[in-house]
């Protein structure tokens, strides 16, 4: 009778993460009697995956009934595959021995590669806000994908960006990979409602790319424009001066009125008007009792926006 | 001694889902002796929440040690609050009796309202694709929030949309609410890379709105433009005619060449060139052996795109 051979028909198997992997193995003979075991890797450090004789292997099921006397099929199925399961799997026949069973013959091995989806891309923006016409950087990160080939694109409001740099790590072989990309985006005044989108295509996504987004509202500061004007008199000896604070973002704003350099009133902007582009407007007014002044008065509207250095606009009120 | 009073100092308490709710209750006297119980709701259908005497209430802990002889504080804390826990909670004193303890006095009740975050908004687009200049509808749904007040906005590539309709259900009181909004979006040829964004603001989100996105790439069909041209002769008696199929989306495209109305060749577009706006171009050519024709030949390039009715462009090849 010909000596037993261990047949592993597939050189390689590729499985999507989360699915089950079936690893095929057949014997050409029932003898010598003895169990089979499956290992990942070869040599002293090999990892036991399944032992027909004993042990608990909750993720492994056998394709055939291994307890049947005439069984020659020792294929197994491993459930819920993750990238950490990648490697070469060997089906090994043992012959009965004492005190321990003795390795008799190994199959040629089946290489299991795992197709793992990238994690949802996380897009993060700059730590501090910048003003229009400045360039800010956004990063996009995703992890845990396999194989290594991946395509990443950046968009701003649907328009593809070209100024970005992408790295995939590690450079060598690994069970899974990570991607890190940094895009440079020039801000414009209308960017409060803008978004940057990081789009990733990978073999596991079946042509349906993953997208991560970030709002430029987190990255932009639009400084206000100030306009001080005198309104028609409501009553004699009273001047009504308004300070129109326009097109600023974000909300945080404190306004101080000065009369001839002396602080008259400080207020924090609360009820704001939102413009279509996402910036805000606010108006403050000051009633000046002209009786109290003999000479002309210089009224200054001083605005501190989002913790930045104050900007101001003055108006000379003529006392007639 | 004055008769015992049951003090529930707070008329109402508002708690975020997932947090613990502390419901305060104090007695003004130690007598009559007897246990306390907490109920949600009043009357025959009230629900037992905690019984000092017996039972297992895994989510309830007492703030004080109720076993201490001189204890007058019967406040409780309920863990892991959900919207289903909303309601009015009553602290009720019983006096010992036979065979059963007898209800003696109830507190005024504390209304527990639960602030629950909306679920991540799910944006879904039309079931079938539409072509530029047509209007498509996108829906945005979110569930499980409380209180009812919520603000929803739609954006397309950062620009706010105004053509939408929003409903919050149910109209009456409920432990939690759902929102459903439908926006109408006019497609343009450049919308393959566009996104619509549904943005929701709610008291539970601390000014950090939730966003759901959908890609117009799933909703749009950009039909191709065809151009048939004759290229310079490669060899005598051979005419090279190309059909340039431009600016189409999605990919699926089949092209048929006809010579004088008879099918010459059919091919499926594979290696496509992607334009910056996300649409695709493809070129097919046909070599015509002019020896085989005595008279002029009408060459037709017929394209079936994305399962739609075929479009075609013809070219009259003059046999000199």
């Amino acid at each position: 009778e010909d000596e037993l051979q261990v047949i592993q028909p597939e050189k390689s198997v590729s499985v999507a993460a989360g699915e089950s992997a079936t690893l095929c193995c057949a014997m050409t003979s029932l003898i010598p009697v003895g169990p089979i075991m499956w290992f990942r890797g070869a040599g002293a450090g090999r990892e036991l995956i399944y032992n027909q004789k004993e042990g608990h292997f909750p993720r492994v099921t056998t394709v055939s009934e291994l307890t049947k006397r005439n069984n020659l099929d020792f294929s197994i199925s491993i459930s819920n595959i993750t990238p950490a399961d990648a490697g070469t799997y060997y089906c090994v026949k043992f012959r009965k021995g004492s005190p321990d069973d003795v390795e008799f013959k190994s199959g040629a091995g089946t290489e299991l590669s795992v197709r793992a989806k990238p994690s949802a891309p996380v897009v993060s923006g700059p730590a501090v806000r910048a003003t229009p016409e400045h360039t800010v950087s956004f990063t996009c990160e995703s992890h845990g994908f396999s194989p290594r080939d991946i395509t990443l694109k950046w968009f701003k409001n649907g328009n593809e960006l070209s100024d970005f740099q992408t790295n995939v790590d590690p450079a060598g072989d690994s069970v899974s990979y990570s991607i890190h990309s940094t895009a440079r985006v020039v801000l414009t005044r209308g960017d409060v409602h803008s978004q940057v989108i990081c789009e990733m295509a990978h073999i596991t996504l079946q042509g349906d790319p993953l997208r991560g987004t970030a709002n430029l509202s987190e990255a932009i500061r639009v400084p206000p424009t100030l306009e001080v004007t005198q309104q028609p008199m409501r009553a004699e000896n009273q001047a009504n001066v308004t300070c129109q604070v326009s097109n600023f973002y974000p909300r945080g704003l404190q306004l101080t009125w000065l009369e001839n350099g002396n602080v008259s009133r400080t207020e924090t902007a609360s009820t704001l008007i939102e413009n279509k582009d996402g910036t805000y407007n606010w108006m403050s007014w000051l009633l000046v009792n002209t009786c109290a002044h003999r000479d002309d008065v210089v009224l200054t509207c001083q605005v501190e926006h989002d913790g930045q250095q104050a900007v101001s606009k003055s108006y000379a009120l003529e006392i007639s | 001694e004055d008769e015992l009073q049951v003090i529930q100092p707070e008329k109402s308490v508002s708690v975020a889902a997932g947090e613990s709710a502390t419901l305060c209750c104090a007695m003004t006297s130690l007598i009559p002796v007897g246990p306390i119980m907490w109920f949600r709701g009043a009357g025959a259908g009230r629900e037992l929440i905690y019984n000092q005497k017996e039972g297992h209430f895994p989510r309830v802990t007492t703030v004080s040690e109720l076993t201490k002889r001189n204890n007058l504080d019967f406040s409780i804390s309920i863990s892991n609050i959900t919207p289903a826990d909303a309601g009015t909670y009553y602290c009720v004193k019983f006096r010992k009796g036979s065979p059963d303890d007898v209800e003696f006095k109830s507190g005024a009740g504390t209304e527990l309202s639960v602030r629950a975050k909306p679920s991540a908004p799910v944006v879904s687009g039309p079931a079938v694709r539409a072509t530029p200049e047509h209007t498509v509808s996108f829906t945005c749904e979110s569930h499980g929030f409380s209180p009812r007040d919520i603000t929803l906005k739609w954006f397309k590539n950062g620009n706010e949309l105004s053509d939408f309709q929003t409903n919050v259900d149910p109209a009456g009181d409920s432990v939690s609410y759902s929102i459903h909004s439908t926006a109408r979006v006019v497609l343009t040829r450049g919308d393959v890379h566009s996104q619509v964004i549904c943005e929701m603001a709610h008291i539970t989100l601390q000014g950090d709105p939730l966003r759901g996105t959908a890609n117009l790439s799933e909703a749009i069909r950009v039909p191709p433009t065809l151009e048939v041209t004759q290229q310079p002769m490669r060899a005598e008696n051979q005419a090279n005619v190309t059909c340039q199929v431009s600016n189409f989306y999605p990919r699926g495209l089949q092209l048929t060449w006809l010579e004088n109305g008879n099918v010459s060749r059919t091919e499926t577009a594979s290696t496509l060139i992607e334009n910056k706006d996300g649409t695709y171009n493809w070129m097919s050519w046909l070599l015509v052996n002019t020896c085989a024709h005595r008279d002029d030949v009408v060459l037709t390039c017929q394209v079936e795109h994305d399962g739609q009715q075929a479009v075609s462009k013809s070219y009259a090849l003059e046999i000199s």
Epitope: E1, V33, E54 | -
Partner: antibody
Framework: QVQLVQSGAEVKKPGASVKVSCKAS????????ISWVRQAPGQGLEWMGW????????NYAQKLQGRVTMTTDTSTSTAYMELRSLRSDDTAVYYC?????????????WGRGTLVTVSS | DIQMTQSPSSVSASVGDRVTITCRAS??????LAWYQQKPGKAPKLLIY???NLQSGVPSRFSGSGSGTDFTLTISSLQPEDFATYYC?????????FGGGTKVEIK
């Protein structure tokens, strides 16, 4: 035909030795193990030991250690069991059995048994 | 060593009866249990291997079940030729051990 044929009955004096043979036919002898099992009159079954016909490795029951030796001759497809220093309580029917389980031990083929009587 | 305890030691039954014999191992043996039938003056005969697998040529009225420490042999409808002694045997590890036997007698 697949079978195990055992040698004939033996009568021995206490202190003597006995060697029982078991000849296999109809299957590949070296592919399986052989166990020896005995049964005293009116008693149950007692496993004595096992030998691999492939390698000659053995495993003996603790109580017989030092008194029993199991061997095989693959050229004749025969297994042997020798028991030394016989005592009267060694009187029993001795069976050889083919061990056929892959991961476990069970006996799907038995010899007819050899009666060994130990008597002074 | 793994002890095997069989019960009952004997059972009286009639033709057509359903007979159940149990076997308990002193420690877990997975499914590595066999059942044998022995008639007077004959060698044992394998009925069931690996707890529940019917040996080739054995009638289907015999069945086995169990795993770990508790096992059962069932004869669904006793036939005249089934009156014999039945043994369980653990095959998980050396030393191999047998149960004490159950004698099935005619009522």
């Amino acid at each position: 035909q697949v079978q195990l044929v055992q040698s004939g009955a033996e009568v021995k004096k206490p202190g003597a030795s006995v060697k029982v043979s078991c000849k296999a036919s109809g299957y590949t002898f070296h592919g399986y193990g052989i166990s020896w099992v005995r049964q005293a009159p009116g008693q149950g079954l007692e496993w004595m030991g096992w030998i691999s016909a492939y390698s000659g490795e053995t495993n003996y029951a603790q109580k017989l250690q030092g008194r029993v030796t199991m061997t095989t001759d693959t050229s004749t497809s025969t297994a042997y069991m020798e028991l030394r220093s016989l005592r009267s309580d060694d009187t029993a029917v001795y069976y050889c059995a083919r061990e056929a389980g892959s991961s476990w031990y069970d006996f799907d083929l038995w010899g007819r048994g050899t009666l060994v009587t130990v008597s002074s | 060593d793994i002890q095997m305890t069989q019960s009952p030691s004997s059972v009286s039954a009639s033709v057509g009866d359903r007979v159940t014999i149990t076997c308990r191992a002193s420690q877990g043996i997975s499914s590595w249990l066999a059942w044998y039938q022995q008639k007077p003056g004959k060698a044992p005969k394998l009925l069931i291997y690996a707890a529940s697998n019917l040996q080739s040529g054995v009638p289907s009225r015999f069945s086995g079940s169990g795993s770990g420490t508790d096992f059962t042999l069932t004869i669904s409808s006793l036939q005249p030729e089934d009156f014999a002694t039945y043994y369980c045997q653990q095959g998980a590890s050396f030393p191999i051990t047998f149960g004490g036997g159950t004698k099935v007698e005619i009522k």
